[in-house]
């Protein structure tokens, strides 16, 4: 429904606190390099303006769109050209082109310093001195590093962040209370960011139809008792929410997400029996809870799919009359029967079904042509099942760190042109699939593993898109969203790759490695492993293992030495020479 003043409408719907937080997130996600204080100033100005519009919706400029208001405000930043270069050219454009321009300049890998966690006492003092600024700074730092973070969910994280400090800064052992909570928030936050990044990539690179198909499959698995019409309504609403958030329309997104949560809770009887607890929670917790709710039980005695989708004489008639509705029904019916399948597998099956109908519903004997379509699904189902079985066996045999190393080698050989930090980050995350999913029973392994891998490979795709270096990566990332993982799995060693020149500096280590956390030390070793493979892509597993074992022993030895730096210098030279000899460099 039309409002005289959109900004007043959203301010009233969301309340001042959420309004300010969401505007801060929006600005930080657009201007990722701007100092905190500048953003706070802009947010305060927008908030004061919004209040004047609440008081009088007919006041000057109150009828302007949010994009116009926010864009005008961002374009007042004095250092735009010096800090952002060509992004400043966006300000010469009119809406909606200006907003599209800002969106295109969002940087998935901004050149920002790593967030270093201060001492607990320092954090608690800052929290008590100015709670509001402390929490705003959290929103700002996360938003600028994760420009596609799901804004209403970030409000939920901020609420938990605040709760952690409120509780733990009063505790006897502040660190023991706070640090595990902060670690959990950090890990969950990274996962949430990556999941949302895939949703935005799906919408932006493959379109609304692709996102809706994903949503039909996922919601049908989650709410198998809901009617198709109900699932379709939820999909339409959810698509609107994510389209808005991915498009930078964070106020509308948060408002619509709240409306969707309200609708789901008001209609839970026709949606799912698992929503009761979620719906008793306050808004932010409620929305989060609904998004994570477990799959409802499948209705008993669901009929065979073949009757409606293969045996019926009306298959082609139904398909031709409303292609997307019919395919949506197929996807809904298949997904609600298969919580044991990954969403991407369900989408592959639906695509196969669609391709078959496109062919067979133009054939002279359509029924004979599509009669065996379900037989075509068998290899598509078996491929991820076998892959997960093999990789879980490998994970159980090696443990997480060595499993990551195996993936590092595998992926470096596939796409050696990709930067070493990206290969390390992506392979480490791919390797986490083991501890995340292999513990699950068979029925939960595939949805856990393959849908998680889709999220991780999307990280590779968005990072690679910024600076493309590999045609193979571009091909796997752009050809088909649902076939990204099989595409990467199918890549063999890149025979066209010219090995990197050997550089001793890459393999020179210092005593500072000894003071690093276990995770940081692993990253150093894994960085060396990637570089090793880039120098010697034809090295065997055994050769690489021998070198890495020697390397681990070298680090352990020198970290125990009295004169660590001398040890690293002298033993390092020997190690490099021995490794060169072992690998024939």
């Amino acid at each position: 429904d039309a409002h005289k003043s959109e900004v007043a409408h959203r301010f009233k719907d969301l309340g001042e606190e959420n309004f300010k937080a969401l505007v801060l997130i929006a600005f930080a996600q657009y201007l990722q390099q701007c100092p905190f204080e500048d953003h706070v100033k802009l947010v305060n100005e927008v908030t004061e303006f919004a209040k004047t519009c609440v008081a009088d919706e007919s006041a000057e400029n109150c009828d302007k769109s949010l994009h116009t208001l926010f864009g005008d405000k961002l374009c007042t930043v004095a250092t735009l050209r010096e800090t952002y270069g060509e992004m400043a050219d966006c300000c010469a454009k009119q809406e909606p082109e200006r907003n599209e321009c800002f969106l295109q300049h969002k940087d998935d890998n901004p050149n920002l310093p790593r967030l270093v966690r201060p001492e607990v006492d320092v954090m608690c003092t800052a929290f008590h001195d100015n709670e509001e600024t402390f929490l705003k700074k959290y929103l700002y730092e996360i938003a600028r590093r994760h420009p596609y973070f799901y804004a209403p969910e970030l409000l939920f994280f901020a609420k938990r962040y605040k709760a952690a400090f409120t509780e733990c800064c009063q505790a006897a052992d502040k660190a023991a209370c706070l640090l595990p909570k902060l670690d959990e928030l950090r890990d969950e936050g990274k996962a949430s960011s990556a999941k949302q990044r895939l949703k935005c990539a799906s919408l932006q690179k493959f379109g609304e139809r692709a996102f809706k198909a994903w949503a039909v499959a996922r919601l049908s698995q989650r709410f198998p008792k809901a009617e198709f019409a109900e699932v379709s309504k939820l999909v339409t609403d959810l698509t609107k929410v994510h389209t808005e958030c991915c498009h930078g329309d964070l106020l509308e997104c948060a408002d619509d997400r709240a409306d969707l949560a309200k609708y789901i809770c008001e209609n839970q009887d026709s949606i799912s029996s698992k929503l009761k607890e979620c719906c008793e929670k306050p808004l932010l917790e409620k929305s989060h809870c609904i998004a994570e709710v477990e799959n409802d039980e499948m209705p008993a005695d669901l009929p065979s799919l073949a009757a409606d989708f293969v045996e019926s004489k009306d298959v082609c008639k139904n398909y031709a009359e409303a292609k997307d509705v019919f395919l949506g029904m197929f996807l809904y019916e298949y997904a609600r029967r298969h919580p044991d399948y990954s969403v991407v597998l369900l989408l592959r099956l639906a695509k196969t079904y669609e391709t078959t109908l496109e062919k067979c519903c133009a054939a002279a004997d359509p029924h004979e042509c599509y009669a065996k379509v379900f037989d075509e699904f068998k290899p598509l189902v078996e491929e991820p099942q076998n892959l997960i079985k093999q990789n879980c066996e490998l994970f159980e045999q090696l443990g997480e760190y060595k499993f990551q190393n195996a993936l590092l080698v595998r992926y470096t050989k596939k796409v050696p042109q990709v930067s070493t930090p990206t290969l390390v980050e992506v392979s480490r995350n791919l390797g986490k699939v083991g501890s995340k999913c292999c513990k699950h029973p068979e029925a939960k392994r595939m949805p856990c593993a393959e849908d998680y891998l889709s999220v991780v490979l999307n990280q590779l795709c968005v990072l690679h898109e910024k600076t493309p270096v590999s045609d193979r990566v571009t091909k796997c990332c752009t050809e088909s969203l649902v076939n990204r993982r099989p595409c990467f799995s199918a890549l063999e060693v890149d025979e066209t790759y010219v090995p990197k020149e050997f550089n001793a500096e890459t393999f020179t280590f210092h005593a500072d490695i000894c003071t690093l956390s276990e995770k940081e030390r692993q990253i150093k070793k894994q960085t060396a492993l990637v570089e090793l493979v880039k120098h010697k892509p034809k090295a065997t597993k055994e050769q690489l293992k021998a070198v890495m074992d020697d390397f681990a022993a070298f680090v352990e030895k020198c970290c125990k030495a009295d004169d660590k730096e001398t040890c690293f210098a002298e033993e390092g030279k020997k190690l490099v020479a021995a490794s060169q000899a072992a690998l024939g460099l």
């Epitope: 082609c316 031709a320 496109e358 062919k359 133009a362 054939a363 359509p366």
Partner: antibody
């Protein structure tokens, strides 16, 4: 734009074979059935069969089994129809036509005239 | 195979006159398509999926029917409509055409 360009007229001896071609352009050749239709002078249309270039699947009218062989080549996006053991009954215009959803033929070639005569 | 019988075989109509031709199937068919052919040229898709007009076909044409009985109607005959019209069924292998209705201008 979609175009179907057929090979030129043929004059052949009885008992011999002929291969007519239909070069497709302007669309995804692999994803549509290519149909072949026979029309004798002053007479109606008779469906011979169809081929799906994506995988080579074919359907034939039983009356033309053993007479017509349909093939397709994806790289020059061309469909072919070979007619064998020709008799004067095979003298006709042969037309290729693209088949679409629910079996209509939306684009037609210009036709190839085959004359079988001694 | 399904036999399609078109009637009349030949008909003539004056400009402005309403024209109806029929296509009767020997057993039920899923969809009927109609093609227009003028001498010396290949057929053109004219009406498809029983009732949809092909691109560029004047709105005076319409198609209808179900089961075994289908028809093509011209609301108001024009000179350019003089041609032979063929029906074609889809839904049963082999695909078959009717023998055609030749429409002449009176």
């Amino acid at each position: 734009q979609v175009q179907l360009q057929q090979s030129g007229a043929e004059l052949v001896r009885p008992g011999s074979s002929v291969k007519i071609s239909c070069k497709a352009s302007g669309y995804a050749f692999s994803n549509y059935w290519m149909n072949w239709v026979k029309q004798r002078p002053g007479q109606g249309l008779e469906w011979i069969g169809q081929i799906y270039p994506g995988d080579g699947d074919t359907y034939y009218n039983g009356r033309f089994k053993g007479k017509a062989t349909l093939t397709a080549d994806k790289s020059p996006t061309t469909a072919y129809m070979q007619l064998s053991s020709l008799t004067s009954e095979d003298s006709a215009v042969y037309v290729c036509a693209r088949g679409v959803l629910l079996g209509s033929f939306d684009y037609w070639g210009q036709g190839t005239t085959l004359t079988v005569s001694s | 195979q399904i036999v399609l019988t078109q009637s009349p075989a030949i008909m003539s109509a004056s400009p402005g006159e309403k024209v109806t031709m029929t296509c009767s199937a020997s057993s039920s068919v899923s969809y009927m398509h109609w093609y227009q052919q003028k001498s010396g040229t290949s057929p053109k898709r004219w009406i498809y999926d029983t009732s949809k007009l092909a691109s560029g076909v004047p709105v005076r044409f319409s198609g209808s029917g179900s089961g075994t009985s289908y028809s093509l109607t011209i609301r108001s005959m024009e000179a350019e409509d003089a041609a032979t019209y063929y029906c074609q069924q889809w839904g049963s292998n082999p695909l078959t055409f009717g023998a055609g209705t030749k429409l002449e201008l009176k």
